[in-house]
């Protein structure tokens, strides 16, 4: 079992942009979690 | 601590469906995306699924793509995999694991075989 | 589609010496997502480094990961037992799909 405890959303956006010529999204990094706002120099979220 | 226990697998004929759940707890479940991913017998991972931490977005490996439904339910803390028309390829264990993009926690799976 | 590939598929080390496993994208990962997970037998997989050189936490130092773009790699600094298993590298830089690479098998030596 994993010990790890926060999960790591990047510091910076997420991208979200739709691929071209398709009906799809790409996304990059952790997207599919909530952004909520890290406390400054920590990726944990609640 | 956090923990993801899936339950529901078995043996299932082709054609069939089977419907196999994860249940989290130790966590904020709705603060997360969660995923499914599976592992034939003596092969590697193949991610299989990822639903947002609210639900709005789901999508698929194009190896499940029309078969296979994730969905959650955020007041539950559950995550499930709805799979139908399935096939002997789909034999595999099946794990939940939390994440955004990677997967911090899994499971430790459920295994699922398509056999007649 | 981002193919992952990892070599060696099985890397044969004795106990105490470094491994060093490659895993190499078709095309380049951006914001380095890349990530290596540890699979041991018969266990779920555990995630070690993500971002490509950042350890999970509780994850020990002799662990760390390196590179950019399509080339990165994982070195395991002085092999203990409990570190013969199966890796795995995955991208998360440009999905879906996220995509895995093949697996190294470190084996004892």
């Known amino acids: 079992v994993s010990s790890v405890q926060t999960p790591h959303l990047p510091t910076h956006a997420d991208s979200q942009t739709p691929s071209a010529g398709t009906d799809t999204q790409t996304f990059s990094g952790s997207a599919a979690n909530a952004k909520l706002n890290p406390t400054p120099g920590s990726n944990a979220i609640s | 601590q956090v923990q993801l226990v899936e339950s529901g697998g078995g043996v299932v004929q082709p054609g069939r469906s089977l419907r196999v759940s994860c249940e989290a707890s130790?966590?904020?479940?709705?603060?997360?995306?969660m995923h499914w991913v599976r592992q034939a017998p003596g092969k590697g991972l193949e991610w299989v699924a990822v639903?947002?931490?609210?639900?709005?977005?789901?999508f698929y490996a194009d190896s499940v793509k029309g078969r296979f439904t994730i969905s959650r339910d955020n007041s539950q803390n559950t995550l499930s995999l709805q799979m139908s028309s399935l096939r002997a390829e789909d034999t595999a264990v099946y794990y939940c694991?939390?994440?955004?993009?990677?997967?911090?926690?899994w499971g430790q799976g459920t295994l699922v075989t398509v056999s007649s | 589609k981002i193919v992952m590939t990892q070599s060696p598929a099985t890397l044969s080390v004795s106990p105490g010496e470094r491994a060093t496993l490659s895993c190499r994208a078709s095309?380049?990962?951006?914001?380095?997502?890349l990530a290596w997970y540890q699979q041991r037998p018969g266990q779920a997989p555990r995630l070690l480094i993500y971002?490509?050189?950042t350890r999970a936490t509780g994850i020990p130092a002799r662990f760390s990961g390196s590179g950019s773009g399509t080339e990165f790699t994982l070195t395991i600094s002085s092999l203990q037992s409990e570190d013969f298993a199966v890796y795995y590298c995955?991208?998360?830089?440009?999905?879906?799909?996220?995509?895995f690479g093949g697996g190294t098998k470190v084996e004892i030596k």
């Open positions: 995955q991208q998360y830089g440009k999905w879906p799909p996220l995509t």
């Open positions: 095309q380049s990962v951006s914001g380095n997502y």
């Open positions: 694991a939390r994440g955004g993009g990677d997967f911090d926690f």
């Open positions: 639903i947002w931490y609210d639900g709005s977005k789901k």
């Open positions: 971002g490509a050189s």
């Open positions: 130790g966590f904020t479940f709705s603060n997360y995306g």
